[in-house]
């Protein structure tokens, strides 16, 4: 912890200015008033402080605002944001997208995924929902950050906002997040024609149930392998060989390359080998001819 000393008269700080880079840690601690610092936070980022000096300034703000910084301070944190932990950020209440933009810019090029995720979470909580302006800000300043939100937070996205989401914004989304986003996307794009609908819904298909995937197989969509590989395992397993063939169209040949990877591997294990042979791809591992398949889970459910 920073040792407490009294401030020498000639070092007294009446304004946050560029002279402070020449102060030692203990001088900063003794001579900078926390309230003055908070009031003049907008000056801090223009001054090339050392990381050690920034630690002292953070310590002062922490003492002044033990319950969390006000947004007037947060907005002007600048490089001091790099010193914040997710625990610090959890105490904040942020509603301004200007604040979000400013801090996202600062975090660029630094390993701050946990802090950024927490910040975005606080913005969504502060604004009450994940509205279009917030989504637009995230997609513009932090591609991929949408996926840092929990499924619970994502559930506050109105379907009308889904159109603002680009495919690359969903690249890092996990199954649980896509489970939340897919029904919203389905609703948002429901009035589109077949091919246009598929283009729009494709990035969200990792959250699609079996029946929707089956429906797509009837629409000549020619799903690419990358999209197929992102489908939920549970959505793929019930598909027949014929349905997968129709779903993938000319891309069906790619199954051979992905033969050892989930969900293709798991799907192969559920298919009859002679059905797989009809694809002419040399896929191996299906159920041999003449074998009977007992679904024990059904029996257990009945007993």
């Amino acid at each position: 912890d920073v040792e407490r000393t009294t401030c020498p008269p000639e070092k007294e700080v009446h304004e946050i200015d560029e002279s402070l880079i020449f102060y030692k840690k203990r001088e900063l601690e003794a001579c900078v008033d926390a309230a003055l610092l908070a009031a003049q936070m907008d000056r801090v980022d223009a001054i090339p402080f050392t990381y050690e000096q920034l630690d002292v300034l953070k310590h002062k703000l922490d003492e002044l605002y033990p319950q969390g910084y006000p947004e007037s301070v947060i907005r002007h944190l600048g490089h001091l944001f790099l010193k914040m932990s997710p625990e610090d950020i959890r105490k904040w209440n942020v509603t301004s997208l200007e604040t979000l933009k400013a801090l996202l810019k600062v975090s660029k090029g630094h390993e701050m995924s946990a802090q950024v995720a927490t910040l975005i979470d606080r913005v969504v909580v502060g604004r009450g929902q994940l509205d279009k302006d917030t989504v637009d800000t995230l997609t513009a300043f932090c591609p991929g950050c949408l996926c840092s939100l929990s499924p619970e937070r994502l559930s506050s996205v109105p379907p009308s906002v889904i159109g603002a989401v680009r495919p690359q914004d969903l690249d890092t989304c996990g199954p649980r997040q896509l489970d939340v986003l897919y029904p919203k996307a389905r609703l948002a794009f429901q009035n589109m024609s077949g091919s246009e609908y598929f283009v729009k819904i494709r990035p969200f298909l990792g959250g699609a149930p079996t029946e929707d995937v089956k429906a797509l197989s009837q629409q000549n969509v020619s799903m690419d392998l990358a999209t197929f590989m992102k489908l939920r395992r549970e959505a793929v397993l019930p598909l027949t060989v014929a349905e997968v063939q129709k779903l993938l169209g000319p891309h069906v040949e790619g199954l051979k390359v992905e033969e050892q990877h989930s969900p293709v591997r798991d799907w192969i294990l559920k298919q009859r080998q002679d059905d797989l042979d009809t694809l002419g791809l040399g896929l191996q591992g299906g159920i041999p001819n003449g074998y009977l398949i007992l679904d024990l889970s059904v029996r257990e459910a009945l007993s």
């Epitope: 070092k11 200015d17 560029e18 990381y51």
Partner: antibody, heavy 120, light 112 residues
Framework: QVQLKESGPGLVAPSQSLSITCTVS????????ISWVRQPPGKGLEWLGV???????NYNSALKSRLSISKDNSKSQVFLKMNSLQTDDTARFYC??????????????WGQGTSVTVSS | DVVMTQTPLSLPVSLGDQASISCRSS???????????LHWYLQKPGQSPKLLIY???NRFSGVPDRFSGSGSGTDFTLKISRVETEDLGVYFC?????????FGSGTKLEIK
């Protein structure tokens, strides 16, 4: 454009004090620090001190007890006061702007200087 | 205080030649923030000093590219690739990493 102009008494008697004013234009003293530098005839530059945007000061260690720098932002003026002058304080005195933003504390613009002779 | 030692004190050159001035500091000029606040100034006869190079190697606006600065830590160099008449004068290095700021004693560039 950026300009700095020093004005001083020219001649000071030994043991008396010196007051010089630096009047600036083209920028604000609330955004830039000002350094004072002197140069004895035929010699090198000696940094005297600086007044920062917030009004704080730093001084040359050897001259600290004799120097005082202040400013009036509204009048765009910086003042140098130096006490107990001796003949070896005879020099040309310059004020210069410290650009801490883009140029990182370098003195990017200088006044033309004012000549001070200490003599009885 | 940081002592800045410049060599040589006087540097006679022929026009068109390369000139090199050395500046050494008594302690490292790397600030805790990672910047090195070492600057070069030129004072032509009868004029005020003018900024040439800031932060070791950055040319100030309007300074010709025949001027270049290099170095790190405590050792720095100013090079003029082809000396012209207008380059004659006294060159000073200066540090603003530590307060008080200090200047080197100067190097006079003159015609051989």
């Amino acid at each position: 454009q950026v300009q700095l102009k020093e004005s001083g008494p020219g001649l000071v008697a030994p043991s008396q004090s010196l007051s010089i004013t630096c009047t600036v234009s083209g920028f604000s003293l609330s955004s830039y620090a000002i350094s004072w530098v002197r140069q004895p005839p035929g010699k090198g530059l000696e940094w005297l001190g600086v007044i920062w945007t917030g009004g704080g000061t730093n001084y040359n260690s050897a001259l600290k007890s004799r120097l005082s720098i202040s400013k009036d932002n509204s009048k765009s003026q910086v003042f140098l006061k130096m006490n107990s002058l001796q003949t070896d304080d005879t020099a040309r005195f310059y004020c210069a702007r410290n650009n801490y933003g883009r140029l990182d504390y370098a003195m990017d613009y200088w006044g033309q200087g004012t000549s001070v002779t200490v003599s009885s | 205080d940081v002592v800045m030692t410049q060599t040589p004190l006087s540097l006679p050159v022929s026009l068109g030649d390369q000139a090199s001035i050395s500046c050494r500091s008594s302690q490292s000029l790397v600030h805790g923030n990672g910047n090195t606040y070492l600057h070069w100034y030129l004072q032509k006869p009868g004029q005020s000093p003018k900024l040439l190079i800031y932060k070791v190697s950055n040319r100030f606006s309007g300074v010709p590219d025949r001027f270049s600065g290099s170095g790190s830590g405590t050792d720095f160099t100013l090079k003029i690739s082809r000396v012209e008449t207008e380059d004659l004068g006294v060159y000073f290095c200066s540090q603003s990493t530590h307060v008080p700021f200090t200047f080197g004693s100067g190097t006079k560039l003159e015609i051989k």
